[in-house]
C-alpha cells in the first residue's frame, strides 16, 4: 500500500468560451481508495478556490458554469490526491478560456449539383456556423474543412475551405451517391465532431472537370 | 516532469536539408501544441510557427514558409522540424517549446545548433 | 509583423540594485478579447530562455517576488527588485498576440 500516484490535467474543453471543463488521469492509486480534488485560481489572485462542479463533465472531471468562466484571466490549476498513505499532486496548469474552444459542429449543411448552361456542373455546398459560436466580437475565427465521398468508398476526400461557409467542388463521379460532411475549428481551438452526413446523388450525366475543386 | 530533448548539434552541408526533433515526455503528447524558435548566434529570438500534435495543424510565421516544415509522430511523441535548402543564414540554435492551454510558452528543449558548413 | 523593441540593451548593476527594463510594441498588444498577451523570458549563458512573466505582471511558477511585470498597450516595465547573482543573463520580451509571436532583441543584465 502506498501513496497515490501523481495525476494529470490532460485536456480542458470549452463549447463556446462561456462555460469549460478540465479533465484529468489518475496516477497509480496505490492499493487503497484515492480522492481527487481540483484546486484552481485566477491570474492576479492568491486565494485558491475548489472545483465547482465535479458532476457534469462526469468522472475525474471539474466544469466551470458561467458564473465560474471568465475569458480575461488565466487559470491556474493543480489536482491533489489522496489516500490513508499521502498525497500527491499533479504539475500546475495554465488555461486560457479562448484557447480550448472546440466549438459544436456547423449547422444547416445544404449540398446541390448545379449544372449552370454556359459552364461546367458542380457540386455546391453552404453551412451555417455553430449557433453557440459569436463571430460578431470579431476574435473568433472559425476555419472550416469539408469531408466527402462515393457512399460505398472506403477513402474520405477533405477539402480545407478557409473561413467560408460555401463551397464548390468540380471533380466528381457520376452516377454516384455521395456523402458530405464539415467541420470548424476556431484558429487556436479544437475541430468540432464531423456535422450529420448530408447525402447527394449525382447525376449520371455529370460531366467531370479537369480542375478538381476550388473556393467560393 | 515535463522534458523536451533535442540534440545538442546537427553539421549539414550548404543546399541540403535537415530534420530536427524534440521528444516530448512526462505529460500527454497530444493535449499541447509545440513551438519551434530561432535564435541566430548573440541576436534575438524568432518565432518559426507551432503545431497542434493532436491533428498536426500548423501555424508558421510566414518568413520561415518554404524553409521550415513542422511534423509529428504522435507514437513516438516527437515533433519535427524539416529546414530545406539551407544556407549559413540558417546557421543558428533552434528550440522546440511547448505551451499550456494557452498561446505562450514556458517549458523549452535545450536546442539543437545547426551549423550549415562546407 | 509587430515590432519589440527593448531598453536598454545591456544594463549594469550592482548586486542588491533594482534594475528597470522597457519594452515597446510598434502597435497595441491587446487581443480582440481583451487580454494582452506580453510575456518576459530570461535567458542565463548556455541555456535555454525560462519563463518569467505572462500576460505582463503574472509571475509564472517558481518565479521569485522580486521580479514584477507592468504596462499596457504598447508600453511595459519589467522591474527586479534587489538583483542577486541569478539574475544574471539576457532578458527578453514578447507578444503573443498577434501572429507571428515577436521577441525583443533582448537585455543583457550584468553586474557593474
Known amino acids: 500500500q502506498l501513496p497515490p500516484g501523481k495525476p494529470e490535467i490532460f485536456k480542458c474543453r470549452s463549447p463556446n468560451k462561456e462555460t469549460f471543463t478540465c479533465w484529468w488521469r489518475p496516477g497509480t492509486d496505490g492499493g487503497l481508495p484515492t480522492n481527487y480534488s481540483l484546486t484552481y485560481h485566477r491570474e492576479g489572485e492568491t486565494l485558491m478556490h475548489e472545483c465547482p462542479d465535479y458532476i457534469t463533465g462526469g468522472p475525474n472531471s471539474c466544469h466551470f458554469g458561467k458564473q465560474y468562466t471568465s475569458m480575461w484571466r488565466t487559470y491556474v490549476m493543480m489536482v491533489n490526491a489522496t489516500n490513508q498513505m499521502g498525497s500527491s499532486f499533479s504539475d500546475e496548469l495554465y488555461v486560457d478560456v479562448t484557447y480550448i474552444v472546440q466549438p459544436d459542429p456547423p449547422l444547416e449543411l445544404t449540398v446541390e449539383v448545379k449544372q449552370p448552361e454556359d459552364r461546367k456542373p458542380y457540386l455546391w455546398m453552404k453551412w451555417s456556423p455553430p449557433t453557440l459560436i459569436d463571430l460578431k466580437t470579431g476574435w473568433f475565427t472559425l476555419l472550416y474543412e469539408i469531408r466527402l465521398k462515393p457512399e460505398k468508398a472506403a477513402e474520405w476526400e477533405t477539402h480545407f475551405a478557409g473561413q467560408q461557409t460555401e463551397f464548390k467542388i468540380l471533380s466528381l463521379h457520376p452516377g454516384q451517391k455521395y456523402l458530405v460532411q464539415v467541420r470548424c475549428k476556431p484558429d487556436h481551438g479544437y475541430w468540432s465532431a464531423w456535422s450529420p452526413a448530408t447525402f447527394i446523388q449525382i447525376p449520371s450525366d455529370f460531366i467531370m472537370n479537369d480542375h478538381h475543386h476550388h473556393h467560393h | 516532469q515535463v522534458q523536451l530533448q533535442q540534440p545538442g548539434a546537427e553539421l549539414v552541408m550548404p543546399g541540403t536539408s535537415v530534420k530536427l526533433s524534440c521528444k516530448a515526455s512526462?505529460?500527454?503528447?497530444?493535449?499541447?501544441?509545440i513551438h519551434w524558435v530561432k535564435q541566430r548566434p548573440g541576436q534575438g529570438l524568432e518565432w518559426i510557427g507551432e503545431?497542434?500534435?493532436?491533428?498536426?495543424?500548423?501555424n508558421y510565421n510566414q518568413k520561415f514558409k518554404g524553409k521550415a516544415t513542422l511534423t509529428v509522430d504522435r507514437s513516438s511523441s516527437t515533433a519535427y522540424m524539416q529546414l530545406s535548402s539551407l544556407t549559413s543564414e540558417d546557421s543558428a540554435v533552434y528550440y522546440c517549446g511547448r505551451s499550456f492551454f494557452t498561446n505562450w510558452f514556458a517549458y523549452w528543449g535545450q536546442g539543437t545548433l545547426v551549423t550549415v558548413s562546407a | 509583423d509587430v515590432v519589440m523593441t527593448q531598453t536598454p540593451l545591456s544594463l549594469p548593476v550592482s548586486l542588491g540594485d533594482q534594475a528597470s527594463i522597457s519594452c515597446r510594441s510598434s502597435?497595441?498588444?491587446?487581443?480582440?478579447?481583451?487580454?494582452?498577451?506580453l510575456h518576459w523570458y530570461l535567458q542565463k549563458p548556455g541555456q535555454s530562455p525560462k519563463l518569467l512573466i505572462y500576460?505582463?505582471?503574472n509571475r509564472f511558477s517558481g518565479v521569485p517576488d522580486r521580479f514584477s511585470g507592468s504596462g499596457s498597450g504598447t508600453d511595459f516595465t519589467l522591474k527586479i527588485n534587489r538583483v542577486e547573482a541569478e539574475d544574471l543573463g539576457v532578458y527578453f520580451c514578447?507578444?503573443?498576440?498577434?501572429?507571428?509571436?515577436?521577441f525583443g532583441s533582448g537585455t543583457k543584465l550584468e553586474i557593474k
Open positions: 503545431i497542434d500534435p493532436s491533428d498536426s495543424y500548423t
Open positions: 514578447s507578444q503573443s498576440t498577434h501572429v507571428p509571436f515577436t
Open positions: 512526462g505529460y500527454t503528447f497530444t493535449s499541447y501544441w
Open positions: 500576460k505582463v505582471s
Open positions: 502597435q497595441s498588444l491587446v487581443h480582440s478579447n481583451g487580454n494582452t498577451y
